[in-house]
């Protein structure tokens, strides 16, 4: 699996989408997990509704939500109030029994917040609200991991 990078801004919401073949994964619940180290286990964060037919209902665990469009074949994860500690490698998974298939590997990058000071100059996003109260834009910029980029930089 290639790794897809999703970039969000600290304090804002980030939407991660994981497309899949709706026929191949028919009847399967989905999950969002966090990779613990490069070869470590993937720790479950949140999973879709226990009843597959209700997978469209948004389920929360803390600041993370999951919802599944089972007909369209898109799993959507929302990370609310993004913080630096949310940065890291995750997986979208399709569950069957005790097994899990990886739908997508996701690297979440948390960027500095251009709204964290007023004198931001060219930091402003065009067309975005200029107050915290009105700012509900969910930035979700994704790309593939570039050559030379490391999803797990060594910790010092």
């Amino acid at each position: 699996h290639n790794t897809t990078v999703f970039q969000g801004v600290a304090g804002q919401s980030l939407q991660v989408s994981c497309p899949y073949d709706s026929m191949k994964h028919w009847g399967r619940r989905k999950a969002w997990c966090r990779q613990l180290g490069e070869k470590g286990p993937c720790q479950r964060v949140v999973s879709t509704h226990n009843l597959w037919l209700l997978s469209f209902l948004r389920r929360w665990n803390g600041s993370t939500a999951i919802t599944d469009d089972t007909l369209g074949g898109t799993l959507t994860i929302t990370l609310r109030n993004l913080q630096p500690h949310d940065a890291g490698l995750y997986q979208c998974q399709s569950l069957h029994g005790s097994e899990a298939d990886t739908l997508r590997k996701v690297l979440v990058e948390v960027l500095a917040d251009p709204l964290d000071h007023r004198d931001a100059g060219d930091l402003w996003f065009p067309g975005e609200s200029e107050s915290f109260e009105d700012a509900h834009v969910e930035h979700s910029i994704s790309r593939s991991l570039l050559e030379g980029e490391i999803p797990f930089p060594p910790t010092s």
Partner: antibody
């Protein structure tokens, strides 16, 4: 011109709390910018610890998240660092600095050395 | 995670000096800007901002200092080293919400 000055005890015992004050003159901390704590370990390594912005919102380094708190006193134009359960690994020179997104850390205090030792 | 090279750079006064800084992640913000900055710390002093956003000299910084690079690879050049330039140079990024610094490069007399 804006000036920042750190103050606080130079010696802290292991397992106790480290508390520092940054006094800002020449600019109101509620007007703009994000007000940071950065530390420098012996051997020169710099570590960003976190900030409190003009509106009072805080962002912390995940490696310190469970131990750090940054607060402020707007009436005195001070902001504070509290680091709990310190060990000898927290011995460092602690700086306060102002972050402007475009310029990085354009203004720094002179730094205060904190030694953690029994 | 920022890697600086070399850790120590012995130079003769008047020489050109070049310091490299490499990031493990792209430093291009989603707004298109690259928040990579350079600082100089002289002995007994706090770091001072030299270059902001890759290549812009901060006020009062002599034009012998220049910055370049993009993405993950950046360079600070000093065209003719003077005695007052000696000290430790740090790169730093404020693109990602976890702000980080390079390990530092000590510029010293050969």
């Amino acid at each position: 011109d804006v000036q920042l000055q750190e103050s606080g005890p130079g010696l802290v015992k292991p397992s106790q709390s480290l508390s520092l004050t940054c006094t800002v003159t020449g600019y109101s901390i509620t007007s703009d910018y994000a007000w940071n704590w950065i530390r420098q370990f012996p051997g020169n390594k710099l570590e960003w610890m976190g900030y409190i912005n003009y509106s009072g919102r805080t962002i912390y380094n995940p490696s310190l998240k469970s131990r750090i708190s940054i607060t402020r006193d707007t009436s005195k134009n001070h902001f504070f660092l509290q680091l709990i359960s310190v060990t000898t690994e927290d011995t460092a020179t602690y700086y306060c600095a102002r972050w402007n997104g475009n310029y990085g850390f354009a203004y720094w205090g002179q730094g205060t050395l904190v030694t953690v030792s029994a | 995670w920022m890697t600086q090279n070399p850790l120590s750079l012995p130079v003769s006064l008047g020489d050109q000096a070049s310091i490299s800084c490499r990031s493990s992640q792209s430093l291009v913000h989603i707004n298109g800007n690259t928040y990579l900055h350079w600082y100089l710390q002289k002995p007994g002093q706090s770091p001072k901002l030299l270059i902001y956003k890759v290549s812009n000299r901060f006020s009062g910084v002599p034009d012998r200092f220049s910055g370049s690079g993009s993405g993950t690879d950046f360079t600070l050049k000093i065209s003719r080293v003077e005695a007052e330039d000696l000290g430790v140079y740090f790169c730093s990024q404020t693109t990602h919400a976890l702000f980080t610094f390079g390990s530092g490069t000590k510029l010293e007399i050969k």
